[in-house]
């Protein structure tokens, strides 16, 4: 029995279906077929669950968590044992195996390992402004997404005909920070942050508006 | 449209056995799974189990097993439940709920069961 | 077993408030937490899947957040036809348990 070399790593965007390859070959009847599907999952690497058994020419569940989520893609029993996974959610990132054991065959490798990295768009960041919007003062301009996987970057820009941020202003694109120093009238207007990463981008805006001083009445 | 009617309300005596059924249309049958969920008077919600409507193997919360028995006729796309040896612990509405986005995706209206002495 | 332990047990509001229900787990759950609305002599409706995702035709005023442990249903300017009861339910581990139930009534 040999299990075919797995691609290595999957990626896909939350709440779509992964599909997970595990194909064999081997010199008996699939009679006695029995295929485990197991994940490790990324945010508790030492607890292995079981997703999906084949035993005996029956399903079983694994983990509830893949439940009414998780079946093989073709009908068992057979050689190809892939499995799908429905409406993916962050937590089924980890690694998969597929261990297949098909009495008498035994010996070669029984093993397949397949990566599965669900991907999550940023969502609506929150754009917020620190500090003292008097002239003169220094402003922060703050930038985040809750979610995002891979972790999102920010990019401010100043929506005018331009869109350069002021001469006075450094930004950190992974933090989602920009200062502008010294600011004045000219730092007045509408800024808009872009949080992207590799499935898709979100935007939040902020209004900035420098507050001149009151001229003193002299009486 | 997914649909999934209950049998009627059961009067019953302490003692004897019910049996519930849940008649689902709308959808592929054999492609999910039907859950048990009791409610007694009044208070929360409680898993009783689940029968995978393509291969009749259940699952059953610990506290149900030897109480409940699933079974399924795919001829005509019901699951049924049976309560055994019910006592006035057992009088409940009784749910069957499909899997779907959520192990309880799509609920019945309900059977009201009542164990009298 | 997970315990899911719902706070408060009533909440008492007046139509064009918003409000906020807790669930707590007894141990970690990741996201997979699910909400339920029961009115009286209903049968229960899923409202928000595994923490925070919306559900068709469920109105967006309902919206869900929280993993692990500490997890909200919020719903932004509550409606008449929203009162009633609401449940939490987990799918990480055997057996599914569900939480003791907020009810939301009229102030």
């Known amino acids: 029995l040999e299990v075919s070399e797995s691609p290595g790593s999957i990626q896909v965007a939350r709440g779509q279906p992964a599909v997970l390859p595990c194909t064999f070959t081997t010199s008996a009847a699939l009679i006695n077929l029995n295929v485990i599907w197991m994940v490790t999952p990324l945010s508790n690497a030492n607890q292995p669950e079981q997703v999906i058994l084949y035993q005996g020419g029956q399903m079983f569940d694994g983990a509830p968590r893949f439940h009414g989520r998780v079946g093989f893609t073709g009908t068992m029993p057979a050689t190809n044992v892939s499995i799908f996974i429905n409406n993916t959610q962050l937590s089924d990132t980890g690694t998969y195996q597929c261990l297949v054991n098909n009495l008498p065959d035994i010996g070669g490798r029984n093993i397949g390992v397949t990566g599965l990295t669900v991907l999550v768009p940023p969502s609506a960041p929150h754009c917020q402004i620190q500090g003292s919007q008097d002239i003169g003062s220094d402003v922060i301009l703050l930038c985040s997404s809750e979610e995002g996987i891979p972790r999102p970057t920010y990019l401010w820009e100043k929506l005018d005909n331009t869109l350069k941020l002021p001469p006075t202003a450094t930004q950190d694109q992974v933090q989602g920070t920009v200062t502008i120093r010294n600011i004045s009238a000219l730092s007045s207007g509408l800024y808009q942050c872009v949080a992207s990463n590799a499935i898709g981008t979100s935007t939040c805006l902020l209004d900035l508006q420098v507050i001149s001083p009151q001229p003193r009445n002299i009486g | 449209e997914v649909q999934v009617q209950q049998s009627g309300p059961e009067l019953v005596k302490t003692g004897a056995s019910v049996k519930i059924s849940c008649k689902a249309s709308g959808y592929s049958f054999t492609g999910y799974y039907m859950h048990w969920v009791k409610q007694s008077h009044g208070m929360s919600l409680e898993w009783i189990g689940y029968?995978?409507?393509?291969?009749?193997?259940?699952t059953y919360n610990q506290k149900f097993k030897g109480k409940a028995t699933f079974t399924v006729d795919t001829s005509s796309s019901t699951a049924y439940m049976q309560f055994n040896s019910l006592t006035s612990e057992d009088s409940a509405v009784y749910y069957c709920?499909?899997?779907?986005?959520?192990?309880?995706?799509?609920w019945g209206q309900g059977t009201l069961v009542t164990v009298s002495a | 077993d997970i315990v899911l332990t719902q706070s408060p047990a009533t909440l008492s509001v007046t139509p064009g408030d918003s409000v906020s229900l807790s669930c707590r787990a007894s141990?970690?759950?990741?996201?997979?937490l699910h909400w339920y609305q029961q009115k009286s002599h209903e049968s229960p409706r899923l409202l928000i899947k595994?923490?925070?995702q919306s559900i068709s035709g469920i109105p967006s005023r309902f919206s869900g957040s929280g993993s692990g442990t500490d997890f909200t249903l919020s719903i932004n300017s509550v409606e008449t036809e929203d009162f009633g009861m609401y449940f939490c339910q987990q799918s990480n581990s055997w057996p599914l348990t569900f939480g003791a139930g907020t009810k939301l009534e009229l102030k």
């Open positions: 709920a499909r899997s779907g986005e959520t192990p309880f995706a799509y």
């Open positions: 029968i995978s409507c393509s291969n009749g193997a259940s």
């Open positions: 595994y923490a925070s």
């Open positions: 141990q970690s759950i990741s996201n997979n």
